[in-house]
Structures are given as structure tokens and as C-alpha cells.
């Protein structure tokens, strides 16, 4: 405050994603993702922290398992209030198969399409989210390799619920979802012990994305 | 909208062989775990099996194992229920229901958020 | 396999009472992966409750679901004429899906 008592300047709160953003989430929608409201719980939580707009962060979510359905694209919604409706009303799309390169591959080929919304110039943030190894992990090197080549930043969420449900080893999967994450793997890649707790790493991730643009 | 649409009641004598339906809709069927649960006549609730219409991997319950046999035909979206020969202790409803959760790799957990109308089923 | 026991039996309650329908499992329910199902005459069950807590879609929110381990409980909050029904518990936390005997909910 200056003598005049006018507001010279201020410092925004780091709560709010205002920068400019070109983020596609892509989910693990398989049967074995349960409760799939943890899923839209943790959307909801993560989207209404971001300032989305044409001008400011635009959101995109891709939905894979034995294939790959786009919820919708980057430019579909103007704002962060028409997201979170949209978000809450995505459901489970089922099957066995986690075909998560296949999912990948999907987000970086069209949902990062100046088609569907994509801005030129404007950084893209991929985060994936799944809860068990790929069926279609022969083709991960190469997906993650492109997505590199496209300056694509990744976060990847590894759940670990099914894993501990059935009481497996959870080394491989915790590995291969580190392989997708970019470097350095410790900013970008989350363990969570089940679906439940997907939102306690809400205000990390979105700490983590909004970083990208400072 | 999903829907699970069953076949309609059936009168059978003891000896009998009988195949019951349940014909998913408003979702991908061959992507959702379907289980059959048993009413007997002013009692509860029974599980007697599920099965995943994508590649027919069926789980039964104990209780139910080669008492019945469940299966499926993916390309017509329906879960089946049959006897080979029906006893007067199988008079019951029967219900199918969409399994929300999973059934793979020995551990099966989910609650069931869509059910058929019922079938009932009287064998004397 | 898990073995569930609810009570009462039976309950008698007016419209606007709240009614309090007990399930206790015979073992720990892993993950509080218990459901609560309402069946009306004549009807297939409708899901009201999974996780123990949450509601199923288009479920009002007179109903509520608590506990965890061996001991669950459906609270509704101001009984409605609908609600007078055979309320199930189910647990499904042991590759099986076992259900209680049922609470009926009758007008007094």
C-alpha cells in the first residue's frame, strides 16, 4: 500500500491455475477402478481449482480401458463451472483390459489436435490415472517416447487399491507408471493406496501442474 | 438408460430343464460383471454366481456350484441361467444385476447398482 | 464366509419417525465394502448405499449409511409412506457377495 493509501500492488493466492494450459486427463475407466466416484470426486477437486477459459486453462478427459472414448475435448467448455457439471456426469465405461498405451497414444494423436482444441504455443500437461499394468505394455516405450517428442508434460497416478485388495506385489505396476511420468519422476508421479484416496493428492498435483507455467 | 430386461415367469415340472434370460441395454454389456441372485418364496437374498459376458468367465457361490450353470451370449447382449434338472426346491425368483466393481485375479468385490424385473420361477 | 445378522427383525414406526436398522458382520468387512438394498413388494432390490456411506444416484438423503468393520448401521433420517419396505445389508469384501436377512420397515 502506498502513503496515498492505493493498492500498488498485490499477491495472488497459489491456489488458482490462471496460467495458460492445455491439460488432457486420461482415465483408467476398467471395472477393477472401484468406487468409480473417487474417480469424479478427485476431478472435481483437481478442476475446480484451475481457471479454465478459451484465454486460460483448457481441460480435455479421455476415458480408456478395452478402448479409448473421448468425454470431451479441450474446447468444449468455457469455463470451470461447465467443466465440473460435465466432469460429475462422466461414468465408468467398464471392461478388462487396461490398454493404457493405447490410451496414451489416443490423448497425444487427437485430443492434443489443434481440432479438438488444442492452442498452438500453449504447454501440454497429460495426467494419467490408472490402477493396474497395461495390457498393451510392449507399445508403453514408444507412446511415452512421442509424447516427449511433443513436449507433452506427464503426471502419472498409480492407485493401488486393486493391487492391495488381492494382496499382489505392487513393484511392476509402481514401475511402469513411473516409466510414463516425465522427469524428474518425483514431481510427476503419485501413489495412492485405493480410489479413496485420490483427493489427498488433489492439492499437490495441482500445486505441481501450476508450477509448469511459473 | 440402462436396463436389465429378464424372461418372463416359468412353470416347470421336477426333472425339467429350463434356461432363464437377461438382456442388458443403455451400457456396454460385454464390459460389466452380471450376477444372479435368488429369492426363495418370502425369504432373502442369495448369491448364486456372476459372470463377465465378454469372454464368459464365470464365478459361482459354494452353495450354487453344478447346481447351475451361467453363461452368456455377447452378441445378443444377454446372461442366461439354466437348470438341467429342476427340483421343487428351486420354486424362487430370480433376479440378474449389474455388478459395479471386478472379478479378476481371484478377488471379486462391487455392489450391484442395476437389477432385472425378476423371474419367477415355480417347479411342481 | 462372512455372515451377516441384522436387526430388528422388524420394525414399527410412523411416517416422520426416524428409523435406525442395525447389520453386524461375523468378521471384519474389508475396506467397509457393505451395501444396503431396499426391496418393496413385488420389486427387485434398489440400491440405496455402497461403501458403507454412499448414496446411489437419485437416492434422497434421508438415507445415510454409517460404520465400519463389524458393525454397520442405514439411518433414514424422517420415514416417508415409500420407505416402509425389507431393507438387505450386503458385504463384498471376500470374493463372495453374502447378504443379511433383512429388516422389514412397517407402519405402526
Known amino acids: 500500500v502506498s502513503p496515498t493509501f492505493q493498492v500498488v500492488n498485490s499477491i495472488a493466492p497459489v491456489q488458482e491455475c490462471s496460467t495458460q494450459l492445455d491439460i488432457v486427463i486420461v482415465l483408467d475407466g476398467s471395472n477393477s477402478i472401484y468406487p468409480w466416484d473417487s474417480v469424479t470426486a478427485f476431478l472435481n477437486d483437481l478442476l475446480e481449482r484451475m481457471d479454465i477459459g478459451p484465454k486460460q486453462t483448457q481441460v480435455g478427459i479421455v476415458q480408456y480401458g478395452e478402448n479409448v472414448t473421448h468425454e470431451f475435448n479441450l474446447n468444449k467448455y468455457s469455463s470451470t463451472e461447465e467443466v465440473l457439471v460435465a466432469a460429475k456426469k462422466i461414468v465408468q465405461r467398464g471392461g478388462r483390459q487396461t490398454m493404457t498405451a493405447l490410451g496414451i497414444d489416443t490423448a497425444r494423436k487427437e485430443a492434443f489436435t489443434e481440432a479438438r482444441g488444442a492452442r498452438r504455443g500453449v504447454k501440454k500437461v497429460m495426467v494419467i490415472v490408472t490402477d493396474g499394468e497395461s495390457h498393451d505394455n510392449h507399445r508403453l516405450k514408444k507412446v511415452i517416447q512421442d509424447c516427449e517428442d511433443e513436449n507433452i508434460q506427464r503426471f502419472s497416478i498409480a492407485i493401488l487399491g486393486s493391487y492391495n485388495r488381492g494382496n499382489l506385489s505392487t513393484e511392476k505396476f509402481v514401475e511402469e507408471i513411473k516409466s510414463i511420468a516425465s522427469e524428474p519422476t518425483e514431481k510427476h508421479f503419485f501413489n495412492v493406496s485405493d480410489e479413496l484416496a485420490l483427493v489427498t493428492i488433489v492439492k499437490a498435483l495441482g500445486e505441481r501442474i501450476f508450477a509448469l507455467e511459473a | 438408460e440402462v436396463q436389465l430386461v429378464q424372461s418372463g415367469a416359468e412353470v416347470k415340472k421336477p426333472g425339467e430343464s429350463l434356461r432363464i434370460s437377461c438382456k442388458g441395454s443403455g451400457y456396454s454389456v460385454t464390459s460389466y460383471w452380471i450376477g444372479w441372485v435368488r429369492q426363495m418364496p418370502g425369504k432373502g437374498l442369495e448369491w448364486m454366481g456372476i459372470?463377465?459376458?465378454?469372454?464368459?468367465?464365470?464365478r459361482y457361490s459354494p452353495s450354487f456350484q453344478g447346481q447351475v450353470t451361467i453363461s452368456a451370449d455377447k452378441s445378443i447382449s444377454t446372461a442366461y441361467l439354466q437348470w438341467s434338472s429342476l427340483k421343487a426346491s428351486d420354486t424362487a425368483m430370480y433376479y440378474c444385476?449389474?455388478?459395479?466393481?471386478?472379478?479378476?485375479?481371484?478377488?471379486?468385490?462391487?455392489?450391484?447398482?442395476?437389477w432385472g424385473q425378476g423371474t419367477l420361477v415355480t417347479v411342481s | 464366509e462372512i455372515v451377516l445378522t441384522q436387526s430388528p427383525g422388524t420394525l414399527s414406526l410412523s411416517p416422520g419417525e426416524r428409523a435406525t436398522l442395525s447389520c453386524r458382520a461375523s468378521q471384519s468387512v474389508s475396506s467397509s465394502y457393505l451395501a444396503w438394498y431396499q426391496q418393496k413388494p413385488a420389486q427387485a432390490p434398489r440400491l440405496l448405499i455402497y461403501?458403507?456411506?454412499r448414496r446411489a444416484t437419485g437416492i434422497p438423503d434421508r438415507f445415510s449409511g454409517s460404520g465400519s468393520g463389524t458393525d454397520f448401521t442405514l439411518t433414514i433420517s424422517r420415514l416417508e409412506p415409500e420407505d416402509f419396505a425389507v431393507y438387505y445389508c450386503q458385504q463384498y469384501g471376500t470374493s463372495s457377495w453374502t447378504f443379511g436377512q433383512g429388516t422389514t420397515v412397517e407402519i405402526k
Open positions: 444385476a449389474r455388478l459395479q466393481g471386478d472379478c479378476s485375479g481371484g478377488t471379486c468385490y462391487g455392489h450391484f447398482d442395476y
Open positions: 461403501v458403507a456411506s
Open positions: 459372470i463377465y459376458p465378454g469372454d464368459s468367465d464365470t
